[in-house]
């Protein structure tokens, strides 16, 4: 029943152009190129996209025309390799162009940079943006796609089209409003925050596929879709998992046209078969394509069937457990995961995968025994501590969050993680700990039944950010170990890390703790980041500092910033009071 089996097309580029339409075709090619060549100027990319589009049109007119039979990788790779400054701008990435497909595409993929050296996107004045939007809407929207894609080289391309559609709608509405800023800025903030979250979620999917393989991704998908569609049969869930895996494999592999096309087909299939999938899809399926796909991806869990029998009957008590396992190991484990997940929307996906792994390990051992049942009879008892560990962790951390509030909770995590992995760069520790801290406001408000899937699956996304940033410049064996050993045990691995006793404290550098009047004009968020950066540096200098010592220094620091920002001569205040603060902090911490 695969929705993706198509007849072979003479011209793949013509086929995708016709399926997607010119607008989406051009947008997706722009995203693909910007995700590969992240440093190239906007104008260069637009030129390449236009050339590819013109070529595609010739192929639509005549599929037998010269080069129309070439693969998309060949066509796009050839086009990218025409960039004149490839060697100067990208260094060794230029060597990819000496390779043949498919090695050339793999080479480009390996050079995607999760943390490209690009300037921060500064938002212009609203009037400036509205003028630019009205002057050339098409260029304005292309620029949005380009800027997001180059900064987020794994952004889920069909979803970026959805973001661009909302971006356009925001400007269309708000640039006509009486108070443009009041209308537009909250919408842009929302898009920015949602976009960052979407990028991070997709990055985990790609890491799962690329670092742990298709089986790992499929297991994740079985668990998540079974929670979401508990009324669907196992065969239906399996079919959706197969198709979803194809979509994400394509997008993560840079095959954005195929990915977007197949995602559209999958949405169509789901909507045509909603009766056997979920009762919650009706509203989604009435929407236009991009909204429909987004809506399906975010749809709430359907209600669980009322009459689900005990799991023990089929997976513990049955005398045919080992026979069924031998018959088709992955199918049997998939059924176990499906049955467990559809009964437990209150568990995180990673917990469900840990339980399935425990079950698999137990069967591997017990099915080799002379009396398997005697061996695996108590397997469900082994699940108890695995379930209780995240429950207890979430309970403790939500209590701490409620006590401290988000900023101070982030600070507690900053200290905790800096002590665990002090070798990691300060910007990475700040970014990751701030995001870890957001779990409080995101998830602690939920009732017990929704807390774990919210919190632990969110933490998986954030810790993957740490893993991909650390992979670029590895500095900590402990981070490498937690990131590479097991995808589902990353969070427990990091949770279990204690203070790194082998760490040699960083030399004290007064410059790190020197602040200037420019801090006063920063937004509250930027000011927090400055203070949190100082906190990480403090812990790196004095990893054995107590919570009380650090709190005292940070309180003094906050008072110092507040005082100097109120002073008439701010710069002099920062210089003089700053020296005093550094001296007092050194004394307090015994530096």
């Amino acid at each position: 029943r695969g929705v993706f089996r198509r007849d072979a097309h003479k011209s793949e580029v013509a086929h995708r152009f016709k399926d997607l339409g010119e607008e989406n075709f051009k947008a997706l090619v722009l995203i693909a190129f910007a995700q590969y060549l992240q440093q190239c100027p906007f104008e260069d990319h637009v030129k390449l996209v236009n050339e590819v589009t013109e070529f595609a049109k010739t192929c639509v007119a005549d599929e037998s025309a010269e080069n129309c039979d070439k693969s998309l990788h060949t066509l796009f790779g050839d086009k990218l390799c025409t960039v004149a400054t490839l060697r100067e701008t990208y260094g060794e990435m230029a060597d990819c162009c000496a390779k043949q497909e498919p090695e050339r595409n793999e080479c480009f993929l390996q050079h995607k940079d999760d943390n490209p050296n690009l300037p921060r996107l500064v938002r212009p004045e609203v009037d400036v943006m509205c003028t630019a939007f009205h002057d050339n809407e098409e260029t304005f929207l292309k620029k949005y796609l380009y800027e997001i894609a180059r900064r987020h080289p794994y952004f889920y391309a069909p979803e970026l089209l959805f973001f661009a559609k909302r971006y356009k709608a925001a400007f269309t509405e708000c640039c006509q409003a009486a108070d443009k800023a009041a209308c537009l800025l909250p919408k842009l903030d929302e898009l920015r925050d949602e976009g960052k979250a979407s990028s991070a979620k997709q990055r985990l999917k790609c890491a799962s596929l690329q670092k742990f393989g298709e089986r790992a991704f499929k297991a994740w998908a079985v668990a998540r879709l079974s929670q979401r569609f508990p009324k669907a049969e196992f065969a239906e869930v399996s079919k959706l998992v197969t198709d979803l895996t194809k979509v994400h494999t394509e997008c993560c592999h840079g095959d954005l046209l195929e990915c977007a096309d197949d995602r559209a087909d999958l949405a169509k299939y789901i909507c045509e078969n909603q009766d056997s999938i979920s009762s919650k899809l009706k509203e989604c399926c009435e929407k236009p394509l991009l909204e429909k796909s987004h809506c399906i991806a975010e749809v709430e869990n359907d209600e669980m069937p009322a009459d689900l029998p005990s799991l023990a009957a089929d997976f513990v008590e049955s005398k045919d457990v080992c026979k069924n396992y031998a018959e088709a190991k992955d199918v049997f484990l998939g059924m176990f995961l499906y049955e467990y997940a559809r009964r437990h929307p209150d568990y995180s996906v990673v917990l469900l995968l840990r339980l399935a792994k425990t079950y698999e390990t137990t069967l591997e051992k017990c099915c080799a025994a002379a009396d398997p049942h005697e061996c695996y009879a108590k397997v469900f008892d082994e699940f108890k501590p695995l379930v209780e560990e995240p429950q207890n962790l979430i309970k403790q951390n939500c209590e701490l969050f409620e006590q401290l509030g988000e900023y101070k909770f982030q600070n507690a995590l900053l200290v905790r993680y800096t002590k665990k992995v002090p070798q990691v760069s300060t910007p990475t520790l700040v970014e990751v700990s701030r995001n870890l801290g957001k779990v409080g406001s995101k998830c602690c408000k939920h009732p017990e039944a929704k807390r774990m899937p919210c919190a632990e699956d969110y933490l998986s996304v954030v810790l993957n950010q740490l893993c991909v940033l650390h992979e670029k410049t590895p500095v900590s064996d402990r981070v490498t170990k937690c990131c590479t050993e097991s995808l589902v045990n990353r969070r427990p691995c990091f949770s279990a890390l204690e203070v790194d006793e082998t760490y040699v404290p960083k030399e004290f550098n007064a410059e790190t703790f020197t602040f200037h009047a420019d801090i006063c004009t920063l937004s509250e968020k930027e000011r927090q980041i400055k203070k949190q950066t100082a906190l990480v540096e403090l812990v790196k200098h004095k990893p054995k500092a107590t919570k009380e010592q650090l709190k005292a220094v940070m309180d003094d620091f906050a008072a110092f910033v507040e005082k100097c920002c109120k002073a008439d001569d701010k710069e002099t205040c920062f210089a003089e009071e700053g020296k005093k603060l550094v001296a007092a902090s050194q004394a307090a911490l015994g530096l």
Epitope: V321, C322, A326, A368
Partner: nanobody, 114 residues
Framework: QVQLAESGGGLVQPGGSLRLTCTAS????????MSWVRQAPGEGLEWVSA????????RYADSVKGRFTISRDNAKKMLYLEMNSLKSEDTAVYYC???????ASQGTQVTVSS
């Protein structure tokens, strides 16, 4: 797909011997414990003997202890049951199964009669 094929059954006089063989395919035989079970005419299934994947653990029903010997050859994907001092009550269809599961094969008929 899992396939198990038993052979070696036949008609034998009381006190006689037989060696049953089970040929396995379609799964990683060397990773699974195996058993022999039997079903006498008009009776339910009776477990006879089991062996762990690495042959380190062998178990027998009280009714066959000391007379039957289970063994396996993982390289050949074969399971054996050596039956000595056969009695009329050993008459049954014998099946090899994965673990202690239910039969999914034809079995081999063993008849002990004078």
């Amino acid at each position: 797909q899992v396939q198990l094929a038993e052979s070696g059954g036949g008609l034998v006089q009381p006190g006689g011997s037989l060696r049953l063989t089970c040929t396995a395919s379609g799964f990683t035989f060397g990773s699974f414990g195996m058993s022999w079970v039997r079903q006498a005419p008009g009776e339910g299934l009776e477990w006879v003997s089991a062996i762990s994947a690495d042959s380190s653990d062998k178990r027998y029903a009280d009714s066959v202890k000391g007379r039957f010997t289970i063994s396996r050859d993982n390289a050949k994907k074969m399971l054996y049951l050596e039956m000595n001092s056969l009695k009329s009550e050993d008459t049954a269809v014998y099946y090899c199964v994965i673990g202690r599961g239910s039969p999914a094969s034809q079995g081999t008929q063993v008849t002990v009669s004078s």
